[in-house]
C-alpha cells in the first residue's frame, strides 16, 4: 500500500436545501483506470461511512445504498454533493480515495471538510 | 414484522475474542442497513456498529474501532459482530436491530430502527 496526497477544502457551508458540495482532489502517481472514492463522517464518537463509489476513469460515479451523495469526476478531481443534510449531520467529511487498478494499490484520506448545515427557520404564518 | 435471534455471547477473559451472529427471518433481509447495540446494567443502550444494506458502508462508535468487526451475509440472512481484544467494559447484552432504511447518517441513533431482536449476553471477565 502506497500513500497519496488529498486535498478537500476545510470548509463548506450547506445550502438552504440541506446540499453541500465540494472538490476532493488526488495527486494521481501514475495512471489509474479503476479509483474508488469514499466518504466518511466523523463526529459524536463514532466514523461513519456516507458513502462509496468505484468508478472507471471517465465514467460517472455510481453510488449504492439509497446514497444520499451524487458526483462526478474530471481527471484527478472528484466533484461530491451530499444532499437530505440537516443541522444535526453537521461535523467532519474525509474524503478517501483508493487506486485500484492496474497496481501499485495507492491509498490518501483528506484532512477533512468541516461542513456546517443550518436547518431553515420556518415561514412566518402570512395573511397573503 | 422481521425476527431477530443473536447468539454467539457468552464469557470470556480479557483480550480473548467473540463472534456474535444474527439470524433474521421475515421480510427482505437484504433492503436494510442492520446495526448492533450494547446495554450495559444500569446505563442506556448504545451504538456499537451498523452495515448498510449491500454491505458497502459500515459505521462504528469511536470505543471498538479496530477491535470489533461488523459484516453481513445477505443469502443467509445474518449479520455478524467480530469482537477482538475484548475488554471488561464491553461487558453488556449485545442486541442486533434493523433499521428502516438502506443505510442514512443517522445509523448510530436507536430511534432508525424497527425491530430488536432479544439479545445475547457478553462478559468479559478481568
Known amino acids: 500500500c502506497k500513500a497519496m496526497h488529498v486535498a478537500q477544502p476545510a470548509v463548506v457551508l450547506a445550502s438552504s436545501r440541506g446540499i453541500a458540495s465540494f472538490v476532493c482532489e488526488y495527486a494521481s502517481p501514475g495512471k489509474a483506470t479503476e479509483v474508488r472514492v469514499t466518504v466518511l463522517r466523523q463526529a459524536d464518537s463514532q466514523v461513519t461511512e456516507v458513502c462509496a463509489a468505484t468508478y472507471m476513469m471517465g465514467n460517472e460515479l455510481t453510488f449504492l445504498d439509497d446514497s444520499i451523495c451524487t458526483g462526478t469526476s474530471s481527471g484527478n478531481q472528484v466533484n461530491l454533493t451530499i444532499q437530505g443534510l440537516r443541522a444535526m449531520d453537521t461535523g467532519l467529511y474525509i474524503c478517501k480515495v483508493e487506486l485500484m487498478y492496474p497496481p501499485p494499490y495507492y491509498l490518501g484520506i483528506g484532512n477533512g471538510t468541516q461542513i456546517y448545515v443550518i436547518d431553515p427557520e420556518p415561514c412566518p404564518d402570512s395573511d397573503f | 414484522e422481521v425476527q431477530l435471534v443473536e447468539s454467539g455471547g457468552g464469557l470470556v477473559k480479557a483480550g480473548d475474542s467473540l463472534r456474535l451472529s444474527c439470524s433474521a427471518s421475515g421480510r427482505t433481509f437484504a433492503n436494510n442497513a442492520m446495526g448492533w447495540f450494547r446495554q450495559a446494567p444500569g446505563k442506556e443502550r448504545e451504538f456499537v456498529a451498523s452495515i448498510s444494506a449491500s454491505g458497502t458502508l459500515t459505521s462504528s462508535a469511536d470505543s471498538v474501532r479496530g477491535r470489533f468487526t461488523i459484516s453481513r451475509d445477505n443469502a443467509k440472512n445474518t449479520v455478524y459482530l467480530q469482537m477482538n481484544s475484548l475488554k471488561p467494559e464491553d461487558t453488556a447484552l449485545y442486541y442486533c436491530?434493523?433499521?428502516?432504511?438502506?443505510?442514512?447518517?443517522?445509523?448510530?441513533?436507536?430511534?432508525?430502527?424497527?425491530?430488536w431482536g432479544q439479545g445475547t449476553q457478553v462478559t468479559v471477565s478481568s
Open positions: 436491530a434493523r433499521n428502516r432504511r438502506a443505510w442514512s447518517l443517522s445509523v448510530h441513533t436507536t430511534r432508525e430502527y424497527d425491530d
